[in-house]
Each structure stands twice: as C-alpha cells, then as structure tokens.
C-alpha cells in the first residue's frame, strides 16, 4: 500500500520507497551481513523504511540490494532519484583502505516480475554514486545527517519492466529513499485543442510530435500540434481550433452563447448581443430571430438589425397638364430602419361613372424617369387618355417589403385628365409636283384625342428659313399648294386641330418644284 505524496505534474512515479507502509522486502545478497532494512523517523517524525550497510572495516565488500520488479508503463526512459546519507571515511578510525565513499547503481530489464535471485552478471551499470555531503561523528552527535540527492536516468527501455540494484563496495550508507519515475507532458489544452498525457521520448534531446484534438464545440482552423520535450514540457504550439458557430471561448472551452446572444460563424470572436429588434430563446444561437413585424432581407448579415417595411410616403401632390400628370411626394416618416428605400408607381384607370371599377393602365402610359425602383420622390406620367379618371398609388418599398406588403406602405391620389390636343402627324407625302404646285397628302394623327376639325399646312421657301411662311387650312387629309415658284425648294409642315387646340407640326417635308410636270411621292425626305 502506498500513501500519496505530491510530485510535479509531469512526473509519473513507478516506485517510491517512502510511500510504502510496512517492510519494503527487497532482496539482499548476501542475505545477512550486508544491506539491512531499518525503520527510522523522517523530519516529520513519520517512520520510513531505509536500507543501511556499514561494513567499512572489512575489505572486498560486494553487497547487493535489489528492488522488486518495477513496471515500465510504456516509458522509454526512467529517472532514479536516490536520497542517501554517507559516512565520511576520514571520520572513522582504522578504516583506511577498506572504507569507500561511493556505491554503484545497476539495472536489469526483464519481462519476469518474479525473479527470486540476484544474478550480478545480468545487471548493467548505470553509474557510480558519490556523495556531495558526507557526515562525521560530530554530525551524528548533533543529529545532523546530511542528506544527498542524486538523480540518474536510464533508457531506452523496451521490456515490460526492470529491477534496480545497489552495490556496496565498503561504504557506510543509508538509502533513505528511492524513487523511480518517468516524465510525461501532462494533458493540457492550448488554442482550444486538447493534447493528451504524452510520455517523453527515449533520449534526452528527443521531441515527440503530438496532434491535438479540438475541444467540444470547436473545429480545426489549422491542424493543432505540439511537441513533448524530454523534460516533460510542451513546446511550440502550432495551429489552433475555433469555437463553432453559436459558441465562444471561455476559460479554454467553447461554451454556448447565452440566451439573447448569437455567433454566426466559426471564428475566434465572442458571442454578440442579438441586434435590435431580434432575440434568441435558446443558448447556442447562430442567429437571432426577428421580432414580430420585423424581417431580415436575404442579403442582410446576421449582425444587422431586423427591419420592417417603410410607412407610406407623405405629402403626395399632383399636377395635371392635359394628358400628363406630374407627381411629387416626401419620404416616409418611418423608413423601417433601412437605407435601401425606393418607390413604385401603380397607375389605375377608373370609370367615370363608377370610380371603384379600376383596371391597370397598361403599357401605353409612359413614366419618367421610370415606373419602379424610383430613387427620387417625383415622377412624370405621360400619354394618358383625355377626360379620364386615374388613380396613382406611390408605394414606398425597401429590402423587406416583400415579406409583409401592406396598404399602409402606399399613398394614392385620383386625378382627371383634360382634353388633349392631337398628336403630331407621322407621315406627310408629296403626291404630285409641278412647276407651280405641290399636291400633299397625310395620315391622321395616331392619337387624335377628339374630333379633328381641320388641318393646317405651313410652308416656306427653304432659303427663307421660316422667316416668311404661308398657311393653308383644310378639313381633308390632302391639299394642293399652288402659286409656287419653279425650280425652288419648299419646306412643308402639317398639324391637326381639335377643340382642344392644335397638335404639334409634323416633321418637315422638303420638295423642289419642277420645270416639267411629274408625279412623285415624298415621305418627309428631299423630293425633286
């Protein structure tokens, strides 16, 4: 039975004579007259078992003492710590020549744990042990026993165990304690990697490479490695582990983020408080859940606050100009906590008799600068029908509007367009050109916007450059322009008139009168 004594964490004791209660019972040779087991009191008045020999008067001493079998436990190199006292030969009268002040230390490797005899030739010498401090008769009187401590190591070992032996060649010695141990690098955690107990290498300069395993709730960033030095110290940590998402490092372990905290990625960062308008209800959250009515867009980072759709735009005003409408508004009071606000315009054409019967305006209506994704707070809408009720909705949208669309995010205005002038005439043709006349024909405007009352033809000599022009009016879609000069270039424009007024003039048609009659068709390009 061994009592517990405290030794360094990097030393594993295989034998400690001071921890044995009762007789050690080691084998001595010769059985009598050599090494003798003696119980003495240590400095704390605890009885300890020692081996003593003091045959200093007799020559040719060869006294052996062998320990019990000591298991190797996988160690390749072991250390032997011997605490002993040794009598100064000079303090003993009449022992010159026979008294020695050293003893020899041996070992013998064996797989057999029950060898009964000492066979000297099996043992390998480790070293001759000499005392740094020997004591005299005076020291005995003063009860000052000078304790020597010597440590030797032996290796590499390969068998299951070994025996130690002490050879006395004529000294006066007391072996106060014998401790056999090996060194290990103790289990440790570095950089969130755990390195197991590792027995040191076979020689005093060897380094044992050890791969660490990531602690719970962590993962390798770089392969964690360390080297176990011969002295039982860990050296040169390489690589590391990182706490998983939802976990943070705390005192060398990866602990789950607290409720109300989160960590999105495997990094060396700590958990973070849930962003505004979000929460976590479990430990170990990798993201936080948005509060009711708040959302996170697909490309929003987990660290961003949860946001909501904006409120409606404010102060919508409209300005109707015949069949065009200009709309302007102010930004919403609440942007929902986002910067990516934009505006969409919805146009609905509503029946005059029943405003509730509305339908989309369709593709004929034009929006400047655009209908959707407006970054400015104004839009111009053209090509509407005259005398028609329109409802325009301005929707404020942001990155999370799609998750919770609501009428609360729009503002609307209803307007009635005025009578509009006709659109311009697209095609004017010269049907016949003579020395003194040009016969013109044209198409009705694409959008008459009412009943066309008449057409107006404006013409002038090209050289005069519109400084002196003449006007001809007709209800038909053709006319003969007479009284022209021969061999002269003329420019013609046509426009339509309704009750709402004149439309725009057509593109110019250039025609040159002839010297002889001819039939030609002009399309607004030069005609000769």
């Amino acid at each position: 039975v061994t009592g517990s004594r405290v030794y360094p964490a990097n030393e594993v004791t295989l034998l400690d004579s001071r921890s044995v209660q009762g007789e050690l019972g080691w084998i001595a040779s010769p059985l009598e007259g050599g090494w003798e087991e003696v119980s003495i009191m240590d400095e704390k008045n605890t009885p300890i078992r020692t081996y003593q020999v003091c045959n200093v008067m007799e020559p040719s001493q060869n006294n052996w003492l062998r320990t019990d079998w000591i298991t190797r436990e996988g160690a390749q190199r072991v250390y032997i710590e011997i605490k002993f006292t040794l009598r100064d030969c000079n303090s003993l009268p009449g022992v010159m020549g026979t008294c020695k002040e050293t003893f020899n230390l041996y070992y013998y490797e064996s797989d057999n744990d029950k060898e009964r005899f000492i066979r000297e030739n099996q043992f390998v010498k480790i070293d001759t042990i000499a005392a740094d401090e020997s004591f005299t008769q005076v020291d005995i009187g003063d009860r000052i026993m000078k304790l020597n401590t010597e440590i030797r190591d032996v290796g590499p070992l390969s068998k299951k165990g070994f025996y130690l032996a002490f050879q006395d060649v004529g000294a006066c010695i007391a072996l106060v304690s014998v401790r056999v141990f090996y060194k290990k690098c103790p289990l440790t955690v570095r950089n969130l990697a755990q390195f197991p107990d590792t027995i040191t290498g076979a020689d005093t300069s060897s380094l044992v490479e050890v791969r660490g395993s990531c602690v719970n709730n962590s993962e390798e960033k770089d392969v964690p490695k360390m080297y176990c030095g011969a002295d039982g110290e860990w050296l040169v940590p390489i690589g590391n582990c990182l706490c998983n998402a939802g976990h943070e490092e705390r005192s060398g372990e990866c602990q789950a983020c607290k409720i109300g905290y989160y960590k999105a990625l495997s990094t060396d960062a700590t958990c973070a408080k849930c962003p505004p308008h979000s929460y976590s209800v479990w430990e170990g959250a990798t993201s936080c859940t948005c509060d009711r009515g708040f959302f996170r867009a697909d490309n929003d980072a987990a660290s961003m606050p949860c946001t909501r759709p904006p409120s409606a735009p404010l102060n919508l005003i409209s300005n109707v100009n015949e069949t065009s409408v200009n709309l302007e508004w102010s930004s919403p009071q609440n942007t929902g906590g986002r910067q990516d606000i934009s505006y969409n315009v919805v146009c609905k054409k509503c029946g005059a008799g029943d405003p509730s019967k509305c339908r989309p305006c369709g593709s004929g209506v034009h929006y400047t600068p655009q209908q959707n994704g407006l970054k400015t707070t104004k839009v111009s809408i053209t090509d509407l029908l005259a005398h028609t009720n329109y409802t325009f909705e301005i929707w404020a949208v942001n990155g999370v509007s799609k998750y919770n669309p609501s009428p609360d995010q729009s503002v609307s205005v209803t307007v009635t367009t005025n009578q509009a002038a006709p659109s311009s005439i697209a095609l004017v043709q010269a049907k016949e050109v003579t020395r003194y006349s040009v016969a013109l024909a044209w198409l009705e405007p694409d959008r008459p916007n009412g009943v066309i009352l008449e057409y107006e033809v404006k013409y002038y000599e090209k050289d005069q450059n519109e400084r002196s022009y003449r006007i001809v009016r007709t209800a038909a879609r053709n006319t003969d322009i007479k009284g022209l000069n021969p061999l002269t270039s003329y420019v013609f424009h046509v426009r339509a008139r309704t009750a709402a007024g004149y439309g725009d003039f057509s593109e110019p048609l250039e025609v040159t009168t002839n010297t002889v009659p001819s039939r030609i068709i002009g399309d607004g390009a030069n005609s000769t």
């Epitope: 005192s251 602990q255 607290k258 409720i259 700590t270």
Partner: antibody, heavy 115, light 109 residues
Framework: QSLEESGGRLVTPGTPLTLTCTVS????????MSWVRQAPGKGLEWIGI?????NTYYANWAKGRFTISKTSTTVDLKITSPTTEDTATYFC????????????WGPGTLVTVSS | AIKMTQTPSSVSAAVGGTVTINCQAS????????LAWYQQKPGQPPKLLIY???SLASGVPSRFKGSGSGTEFTLTISDLECADAATYYC?????????FGGGTEVVVK
C-alpha cells in the same frame, strides 16, 4: 429555485475547510456557479466559477488558495490553507443564462479563521 | 483582470431625492454592456437590480435606472425611499473574470 451554503465555522490557520452550496429547483448541468466572499465590513470579492462542464476558473488572487468542485446537487469550495485574511462570509451564486452576472444568491456562510 | 472603480464611496440624500453612482471599468466590458448593479443590505446577500447596463431586473422599481456602455456606467436612483438605504455594487465581466466595484453606501435622510 434556491441556494444554501453550509460548512462555515471557526478554524485555525492552515486547517483546510470545505464549504458546500446545496441547490434546489434547478440543475447544475444547466448553470455555471460562482463563489463570492465578503470580509466583515468590506466589499464583495469574486473567487471563481465552476462551469456546467465541470471545468473551473479562478480569480488570479484565488489560484492555489481555493478549489471548486461539484456533485449533481452541490457545489463545494475548499479553502486549502486558510489564513486570518480568509475570514469572511462566503456566498455561492448562480450565473444567469441571459447575461454575465449572478441572478441567484445563497444567504452566505461565515468562516472565521483564528488561532 | 478588469478593474472596476466605483464613486463615490458614500452618498447621502433626502427622501424623494436622487442619487447617482458611477462605475468606471479599466477596459471595455464584454459586449460593451455586460455590467450589473446589485443592492446589499446588512446581513443579506446582494440583490440584482440592473443587468446588461440598463435592463431592469424582475420586480425592481423603475426608480432604478442604469445607463452607460464601454467603460463608463451609471446607476441613478430617483424618488429615494427609506428602503433604498443600502450598499450598491457594480459587477463587470471581461475575459473570463468578474470584478466587483468597491461599493457605494447610500444614506437616506
């Protein structure tokens, strides 16, 4: 949910002493537990913590002087070699699961170290 | 370890009055807001008042208000009552360590 410390008494310097905190109404596998002390007429002093995992962490000044351990329903604080400066009321306290701080305290137990 | 400096060490005010207690950390606390305030009366364990700098603990009157972040924190007690006479402690957390402030004794006249 409650905590109760016990084991406080008069001890001579150098005599190891173990204080026990008995928990009820919650599981020690779900919470980290701290020990805090308060010398007579002085402020509060955090000693250390035992995590749910069983791992421990101590204030710098407390390393080597105290050992925290636990069973399924108790948390122990061992004062390894008390000195007169260790005379204090010792509290065990539960660390909150929602913030860094203690949300539940025991009434404390008085330790007097005197020769 | 983080160091918490609490001022003043003692403060006196009349019933109905207001007191302000300051707590300064030697470095930013965890998350910039992991600071708690406790009230302790003689012979009793500390009682949690405020956590994460400004959140009111359950059952604590709204007369107690916590504010601040990073390294500077304040506990304000308004409409003082006789029952508020106690010692108040801040508790900061950083890098595995907890540290209490030295305490502020509040005397209510």
């Amino acid at each position: 949910q409650s905590l109760e410390e016990s084991g406080g008494r008069l001890v001579t310097p150098g005599t190891p002493l173990t204080l026990t905190c008995t928990v009820s109404g919650f599981s020690l596998s779900s919470y980290h537990m701290s020990w805090v002390r308060q010398a007579p007429g002085k402020g509060l002093e955090w000693i250390g913590i035992i995590y749910r995992s069983g791992n421990t962490y101590y204030a710098n000044w407390a390393k080597g002087r105290f050992t925290i351990s636990k069973t399924s329903t108790t948390v122990d604080l061992k004062i390894t070699s008390p000195t007169t400066e260790d005379t204090a009321t010792y509290f065990c306290a539960r660390e909150s699961s929602t913030f860094y701080g203690m949300d539940l305290w025991g009434p404390g137990t008085l330790v007097t170290v005197s020769s | 370890a983080i160091k918490m400096t609490q001022t003043p060490s003692s403060v006196s005010a009349a019933v109905g009055g207001t007191v302000t207690i300051n707590c300064q950390a030697s470095q930013s606390v965890y998350g910039n807001n992991e600071l708690a305030w406790y009230q302790q009366k003689p012979g009793q364990p500390p009682k949690l008042l405020i956590y994460t700098a400004s959140s009111l603990a359950s059952g604590v009157p709204s007369r107690f208000k916590g504010s601040g972040s990073g390294t500077e924190f304040t506990l304000t007690i308004s409409d003082l009552e006789c029952a508020d006479a106690a010692t108040y402690y801040c508790l900061g957390y950083k890098s595995d360590d907890y540290t209490f402030g030295g305490g502020t004794e509040v005397v209510v006249k």
